[in-house]
Interface confidence: low
């Protein structure tokens, strides 16, 4: 006896759904996809906005930092002397860190040609050098922990830093000297930061004076000069002192530098 099963296949669920349900499902899918795309785009926007806010905050911090240095240099006593010294040493360290020789791969070199040539970093930090010359202009050398970023700033005749690009520069000098009141003249020890622009007379940018110490044989004192100045191409800056023989040339005592802002 042969039994035959007339097995009807079940109707597909999809075809059984009413049209209103299909439209609802379609709209729901479109809504969810739109929601996902919208969320993704909003996340990207938010990320970029936060980056911009962060940049602005950093810029504000940099401005505050520069203002603090300026306050220290103008002698405003809103900060303790210790803070000022700390800030100055941090700033000098920061300048040196910027100029640390990073190993550049060929790829970075080509990038530097494209981007760096338009606005290259210009910075210099030179170290004092004892001189047999009787001139009041201090002598400097590229030695020890010095910085010379590129040929857009050069040390000329060991006495002046010369820039090839116009712009705002932070120029600083630290002069440490050892003097005694009895052995020195009555006049104080004066350090001056001077500018010589092409076709113009020399001019004093900054000046500081210290009275002589009563310590024997002499007392060490330091003068720090620093400020932001507009320099023209070919402008040179140098440091003058009343008595170069009293300047201390030990490691880290006397230095001179600039940084293009």
């Amino acid at each position: 006896m042969i039994e035959t099963y007339n097995q009807t296949s079940p109707r597909s669920a999809a075809t059984g759904l009413p049209i209103s349900m299909k439209i609802f499902m379609y709209l729901l899918t479109v809504f969810l996809i739109t929601q996902m795309i919208g969320s993704a785009l909003f996340a990207v926007y938010l990320h970029r906005r936060l980056d911009k806010i962060e940049d602005e905050r950093n810029l504000h911090e940099d401005f505050v930092f520069m203002k603090t240095i300026q306050r220290c240099n103008t002698g405003e006593r809103s900060l303790s002397l210790l803070n000022c010294e700390e800030i100055k040493s941090q700033f000098e360290g920061f300048v040196k860190d910027i100029m640390l020789n990073k190993e550049e791969t060929k790829k970075e070199n080509s990038f530097e040609m494209q981007k760096g040539d338009q606005n290259p970093q210009i910075a210099a930090h030179v170290i004092s050098e004892a001189s047999s010359k009787t001139t009041s202009v201090l002598q400097w050398a590229e030695k020890g922990y010095y910085t010379m970023s590129n040929n857009l700033v050069t040390l000329e005749n060991g006495k002046q830093l010369t820039v090839k690009r116009q712009g705002l520069y932070y120029i600083y000098a630290q002069v440490t000297f050892c003097s005694n009141r009895e052995a020195s003249s009555q006049a104080p020890f004066i350090a001056s930061l001077c500018l010589k622009s092409p076709g113009r007379f020399e001019r004093i940018l900054l000046r500081a004076a210290n009275t002589h110490s009563s310590a024997k044989p002499c007392g060490q004192q330091s003068i720090h000069l620093g400020g932001v100045f507009e320099l023209q191409p070919g402008a040179s800056v140098f440091v003058n002192v009343t008595d170069p023989s009293q300047v201390s040339h030990g490691t880290g005592f006397t230095s001179f530098g600039l940084l293009k802002l």
Partner: nanobody, 118 residues
């Protein structure tokens, strides 16, 4: 990759001269201070000379002052050491080195042997 390749070493009689060369690649040569360091047989490393990135300043160890001259050609990425009035005590392996700061060296060559003997 930073590479420093010395050449020009050899045997020379006392009072003679030699010129060492160092071909540099893999970094921005005209931004780096360069130097020469030597190591005599059985002795430690001795700094010989340094030249600043643009060649504006040169520095020498007292033992070689007046006899050795360091120079560089930035267009060829090459460092040189001209050695005159050589003495037996100048016998050493001479290394060309890239300076990070002052007399801190971060990359060295393989070295070239200079023998001063009669």
């Amino acid at each position: 990759e930073v590479q420093l390749l010395e050449s020009g070493g050899g045997l020379v009689q006392p009072g003679g001269s030699l010129r060492l060369s160092c071909a540099a690649s893999g970094f921005t040569f005209n931004k780096a201070s360069m130097g020469w360091v030597r190591q005599a047989p059985g002795k430690g490393l001795e700094w010989v000379s340094t030249i600043t990135p643009h060649g504006s300043s040169t520095y020498y160890a007292d033992s070689v002052k007046g006899r050795f001259t360091i120079s560089r050609d930035n267009s060829k990425n090459t460092l040189y050491l001209q050695m005159n009035s050589l003495r037996a005590e100048d016998t050493a392996v001479y290394y060309c080195a890239k300076q990070r700061w002052g007399v801190e060296f971060d990359y060295w060559g393989q070295g070239t042997l200079v023998t001063v003997s009669s």
